[in-house]
Amino acid sequence: GSERTCCPVNWVEHERSCYWFSRSGKAWADADNYCRLEDAHLVVVTSWEEQKFVQHHIGPVNTWMGLHDQNGPWKWVDGTDYETGFKNWRPEQPDDWYGHGLGGGEDCAHFTDDGRWNDDVCQRPYRWVCETELDKASQEPPLL
């Protein structure tokens, strides 16, 4: 594939990544799939600056990110190491709360109204953020 050198229309460039901010809501799996179809992934937060950048753009609204523990341990969707990486959980979170009455616990992470993270039921229809790296090769076939 060819290397992407600029962000697609309606995406925002920041520190060699492109970001797309939804204005509607989807379940985490649907949001994840949406980003994959755009040759991107749900946002992976790796630094204070990236946290602040995303927080600025989403405002005080619950928004999915690319972090989940549906298979046991917490994992970032792009393979970034969770244990050694940036974390910004709200106090007492993640708590895998079962008291919501929707079945199961809470396996997907989202930004809360103050930017800090919470785990929640993956079926909730929250907004989401897609991210793709500018220097990575796109999956589109090269134009002949």
Epitope: E49, W89, D114, G115
Partner: antibody, heavy 119, light 107 residues
Framework: QVQLVESGGGVVQPGRSLRLSCAAS????????MHWVRQTPGKGLDWVAV????????YYADSVKGRFTISRDNSKNTLYLQMNSLRAEDTAVYYC????????????WGQGTLVTVSS | DIQMTQSPSSLSASLGDRVTITCRTS??????LNWFQRKPGKAPKVLIY???SLQSGIPSRFSGSGSGTDFTLTISSLQPEDSATYYC?????????FGGGTKVEIK
């Protein structure tokens, strides 16, 4: 009401160590990040370090990295700053401040403790 | 590191005057700009956070504006108790950095 009280300041020789404490009350200490900020004599404010509410992240100013360590004991409602290899330019009033998660500004500050590094 | 250029470094104004202090950053910080007031022998106090939000308990004569790299603190009608040094601070990037301060005196 929110109260932050720093202690542990004093006169120390260059190269020596000092540990500052900040006792917090009037709020749920374990729910807030905390900063250390210093005011050098006749000069401005200088951010030193921040620690997350659960200690999961710690960040430092370049001028103190490798010499100072920020830590906290949530069971004691206390924030610490371990200062090693002190230099004359570390002379300052040291303040602890509570972090506002929306802005990362210090929304409440202590009265400060004076550290003087001199031979 | 993000550099903070605050101006003026000092000013003298009369009671009731409108006072404006500016802060310019070396790169965009979106709206992560906070304003503090410091009086001798007292702890610094946050006035404005995220560029324009008034901190609880702060008089409404204080206001903030700006985004990106250019920010302003305005005191709409200077009062005796406003004699102090004012600092801007960016909280977008580590290390957090402060401006050099503006000393406000009453004529």
């Amino acid at each position: 009401q929110v109260q932050l009280v720093e202690s542990g300041g004093g006169v120390v020789q260059p190269g020596r160590s000092l540990r500052l404490s900040c006792a917090a009350s009037g709020f749920t200490f374990s729910s807030y990040g905390m900063h250390w900020v210093r005011q050098t004599p006749g000069k401005g404010l200088d951010w030193v370090a921040v620690i997350w509410h659960d200690g999961s992240n710690k960040y430092y100013a370049d001028s103190v990295k490798g010499r100072f360590t920020i830590s906290r004991d949530n069971s004691k409602n206390t924030l610490y700053l371990q200062m090693n290899s002190l230099r004359a330019e570390d002379t300052a009033v040291y303040y602890c401040a509570r972090d506002d998660p929306r802005s990362s500004a210090g929304d409440y500050w202590g009265q400060g403790t004076l550290v003087t590094v001199s031979s | 590191d993000i550099q903070m250029t605050q101006s003026p470094s000092s000013l003298s104004a009369s009671l009731g005057d409108r006072v404006t202090i500016t802060c310019r950053t070396s790169q965009s910080i979106f709206n992560y700009l906070n304003w503090f007031q410091r009086k001798p022998g007292k702890a610094p106090k946050v006035l404005i956070y995220t560029a324009s939000s008034l901190q609880s308990g702060i008089p409404s004569r204080f206001s903030g504006s700006g985004s990106g790299t250019d920010f302003t603190l305005t005191i709409s009608s200077l009062q005796p108790e406003d004699s102090a040094t004012y600092y801007c601070q960016q909280s977008y990037s580590i290390p957090l950095t402060f401006g050099g301060g503006t000393k406000v005196e009453i004529k």
